[in-house]
Amino acid sequence: MAPWPELGDAQPNPSKYLEGATSQQPITPDKSKETNKTDNTEVPVTKFELLPTYSTATLIEEPTEVDDPWNLPTLQDSGIKWSERDAKGKILCVFQGIGRLILLLGFLYFFVCSLDVLSSAFQLVGGKMAGQFFSNSSIMSNPLLGLVIGVLVTVFVQSSSTSTSIVVSMVASSLLTVRAAIPIIMGANIGTSITNTIVALMQVGDRSEFRRAFAGATVHDFFNWLSVLVLLPVEVATHYLEVVTQLIVESFHFKNGEDAPDLLKVITKPFTKLIVQLDKKVISQIAMNDETAKNKSLVKIWCKTFTNMTQMNVTVPSMANCTSHSLCWTDGIQIWTMKNVTYKENIAKCQHIFVNFHLPDLAVGIILLIISLLVLCGCLIMIVKILGSVLKGQVATVIKKTINTDFPFPFAWLTGYLAILVGAGMTFIVQSSSVFTSALTPLIGIGVITIERAYPLTLGSNIGTTTTAILAALASPGNTLRSSLQIALCHFFFNISGILLWYPIPFTRLPIRMAKGLGNISAKYRWFAVFYLIIFFFLIPLTVFGLSLAGWPVLVGVGVPVVFIIILVLCLRLLQSRCPRVLPKKLQNWNFLPLCMHSLKPWDAVISKFTGPFQMPCCCCCRVCCRVCCLLCGCPKCCRCSKCCQDLEEGQEAQGVPVKAPETFDNITISREAQGEVRAPDSKTECTAL
C-alpha cells in the first residue's frame, strides 16, 4: 500500500482542499463585501451573513497566482476604527482589550494546567504498565526495543521527563548501561511529540485551520522520527553519542548544585496540586523490579512525613545472611537480625481532591483524563476564539510580520536560527516542550505563525527541553550526577544532530514537506489524523515491541520485507514524480493497484458508514449545549457549532434530508464549497430536538 495516499496530488489542485471559507467568510480577493455584492465580474461569491459576536474578523486570502491552502489568511479588521470612536467607545475598547488579555492569560493558564493534569492522568492509567516495560531485560541487547519502549512509556505517561528520570535511576543503579539508555531517550523524544498532535486534533472543526494546526504539530513528529531513522543506526554502529558525552562528563569535575529552576511550575503547581498529586517514585521502583511497588498507589496521600533512622528487627532467610552470628537470633521459627531501617511517619495528608476517595489508580486516571481533555479542549477553543478577535487588522499584520518575516538579505538565513533560540528559550521558561509546542499549535492553526517558522521554533523547543534536563542533572545528588548528566547530554546532542540533519539546508527540511502532506490528507479525511496517531504512536511501537520480544530472527524476518516494501514504494514514488518516463507505463501511477491500496476514498466510505450514525446526535447535542449557553449569557448569537456539523447539514440538505430551521442564533448561511468532502450519513435523522 502506498504509504501516503494521494500525496502526489497535494498541490496541483489546491482548490480541492479549499473550503468556501477558512472561518465563516468566503475566500475572495481583498475587496469589501459591498463591492462584491454589486460587482459580479470578480470571483463569484456566495452570500455570507457574519455572526457579529462570533468574530469581527473577515478572513481573506491574499491574492496569489494560485490559491495555496498553506497561505496564511489575512485577518482583516471589520470593526470601527480607533479614530472614529468617541471617548466612551475608546474607554470601552481599552477595557475590552484588557478583558480579552486577562481572559486569554486565564485560558492559557488552565490550558497549561490541563496538560499537567493530563500527564498525571496518563501516568495513573498507564504508569505502572510503563514501568514494567523498563524491567524487560532484552532492552540491554536490542536498541530497537529500547527505542519503542521509550516511545510507548512516554506516550503512556505523557511526559518525557518521567521516562528520562526512570532511565537515569536505572543507569545510576547499574540496571541499565548508558549505551542501552540512548535508544530509550530517542524514543522518549518521539513520544513527547504526541501531546501537541492531540492538541491539534481539537481544531478539527475547521478544515483550513485543522490543515495548518495538524501539519504544525506533526512537523515535530516527523523531525523526531526522521532523526531516529538516521541517528539510531549511526549510534548503534559508532556509539558517537555515548563516546562524546562520556568525554564531556569525564573532562569536568562537577559539584552537584542548586535545584533546576521551576519557572512556569511555580504558577501552575499551586492549582494542579489541588487536583491530584502523584508519587512518581513508584513508576521508577517498578522499573527497577521492586515487587512491593506494584501494590502501591501512585496517588500521593501523605505530603508531610517524618523519616527517622531506627534499628529494627527484621527476618532473614538464613544464618548465612547475617553479618555475624552474634547479630542474629531466632524466635523458634524464623531467623532475625537487627537492621538500620528508615521509618517513615505520616504527619499530614495532601490537600488534593482524591486524597480521601481511596479510588483505584485506574479510576482516578480515567476521571482526570476525561476532565483534563474537556478542559484542554474548552481552553483551546476559547484561546482560538479570543486570538481570532484580538489578532486582526494592524495587530495581526504586526505580529505576523514580526514572527514570519526574515531578516534582510544577506542575513535571511539567520532568522531560522534565531527562531531556534527563541523556541529553546521559551521552552526553558515553561520547562516543557509539550507545553510550548501545544501552545504553538493553535497559533499555527489560526494562521499567526507559518509552518516554516513553527519548524525552527519546534526544533528550538527540543533543545530547550534538553537544557532543562542538563540543569536538573547538575542539581541531582552525587550518586546519580554522572549518569543523569551523560543521559541529558545524549539527549542534547541527539537533538543537535537532528537539527544539523534536517534544518540548515532548505532542501533537507523534509519534515515540513511531510507534515504539509499529512496536513492535506487529514484536512480532506479528518479521521486519518486519528488513524495516524494510533498507527505511529501505538501500533508500530507495539508491533516492534512484540516482534522484539519474539527475538531477533522474528524481528528481522518480518522487518526486512516491510522495510524493503517501504523503500520500493518510496523509490517508485520518487521516480513517478521526478522522471516518470523511465518507468513502464503501468508503473507511472498507482492505478495498477486496487483502489483501496492507493487512495483513502474507499476507506473514507467505510469509516463514514461507521461514524455516520454518531455524527447527527453529536451535532444535535452540540446545538442543545449552544442553546443553553446562549440562554445563560443572554446573548442569542454568541455560540455556534463546529463546522463539521454545518458540513453534515449541508450534505443532508443536498440529499433532501430535512434539517431544522435556523434559530436566531444560527445566523449563518454556508456555501456549497464549504461542504468539503464530509459525506452525510445514510440515516435520515432529523435534529428536531431543537
Epitope: N313, M319, H325, S326, L327, C328, W329, T330, D331, G332, I333, Q334, W336
Partner: antibody, heavy 119, light 107 residues
Framework: EVQLVQSGAEVVKPGASVKMSCKAS????????IHWVKQAPGQGLEWIGA????????SYKQKFRGRATLTADTSTSTVYMELSSLRSEDSAVYYC????????????WGQGTLVTVSS | DIQMTQSPSSLSASVGDRVTITCSAS??????LNWYQQKPGKTVKVLIY???SLYSGVPSRFSGSGSGTDYTLTISSLQPEDFATYYC?????????FGQGTKLELK
C-alpha cells in the same frame, strides 16, 4: 489476660500416639509463636518445636522431627501436638508456651500435660 | 546444637544471701539468653531476657549479665519465695536449648 490451657493427663501404650491441645486466649492468636517444651520426671526442660499459627510455619528439634506434629486451628485458637511411636522415655510433662514477638522468650506457659507411656 | 551448661547443679543458701548462677554456652550466643524460674507444681516464669533485661513484673533483686559464651544470674538478696529451680535458655540458633537447671535450696 493471656492464658494457655492444656488438655488433661494421658496414659498411653508404647507405639501408640497421643494428641494434646493448648487453647490460647487473651491475645491475638495468629500473632505469636507457640512452643512445646518437654520435662521428663526429675529432669530439665527440653524444646520440642514451635508453630506460628499465622502462617502454619513449624520448626522441630531434629530428635522429634517425624514423630512430633504441630498443628493450629485458628477458629478455636488451639494448637495441637501429636506425638507418635511413643516409647517409655516419652513419659513426661509437656508444656506449651507463648514466645514473644521476634524473640524466643517464653513469657506465658500452660499448666502442662502429663503423658505416661506404660504397657 | 548449642550446649548449655549450668553451674552449680544445686545450691544451698539462706534468706538475704547474694546468689550467683552461671551458664556457659558451647559457642558465642551474642546475649540471646533467657533465665527462667520453676517452682514445684507451678508454671514456669521468665525472669531475664536478652541476657540482662529484666522482664516486667520481676523484682529488681534479679539481674543478669555476661556476653559471648558466659552468663550469670544474680539474686542480690535472697527471699523465701526465690527457692526454686533456675534454667538458662539460648535463642541464638535453632534448636533452642536449655541448661540442665540449678536447684536453689534453703540452707
Amino acid at each position: 489476660e493471656v492464658q494457655l490451657v492444656q488438655s488433661g493427663a494421658e496414659v498411653v501404650k508404647p507405639g501408640a500416639s497421643v494428641k494434646m491441645s493448648c487453647k490460647a486466649s487473651g491475645y491475638t492468636f495468629t500473632g505469636y509463636i507457640i512452643h512445646w517444651v518437654k520435662q521428663a520426671p526429675g529432669q530439665g526442660l527440653e524444646w520440642i518445636g514451635a508453630i506460628y499459627p499465622g502462617s502454619g510455619a513449624t520448626s522441630y528439634k531434629q530428635k522429634f522431627r517425624g514423630r512430633a506434629t504441630l498443628t493450629a486451628d485458628t477458629s478455636t485458637s488451639t494448637v495441637y501436638m501429636e506425638l507418635s511411636s511413643l516409647r517409655s522415655e516419652d513419659s513426661a510433662v509437656y508444656y506449651c508456651a507463648r514466645g514473644e514477638t521476634a524473640r524466643a522468650t517464653f513469657a506465658y506457659w500452660g499448666q502442662g500435660t502429663l503423658v505416661t507411656v506404660s504397657s | 546444637d548449642i550446649q548449655m551448661t549450668q553451674s552449680p547443679s544445686s545450691l544451698s543458701a539462706s534468706v538475704g544471701d547474694r546468689v550467683t548462677i552461671t551458664c556457659s554456652a558451647s559457642q558465642d550466643i551474642g546475649n540471646f539468653l533467657n533465665w527462667y524460674q520453676q517452682k514445684p507444681g507451678k508454671t514456669v516464669k521468665v525472669l531475664i531476657y536478652y541476657a540482662s533485661s529484666l522482664y516486667s513484673g520481676v523484682p529488681s533483686r534479679f539481674s543478669g549479665s555476661g556476653s559471648g559464651t558466659d552468663y550469670t544470674l544474680t539474686i542480690s538478696s535472697l527471699q523465701p519465695e526465690d527457692f526454686a529451680t533456675y534454667y538458662c535458655q539460648q535463642y541464638s540458633k535453632l534448636p533452642l536449648t536449655f541448661g540442665q537447671g540449678t536447684k536453689l535450696e534453703l540452707k
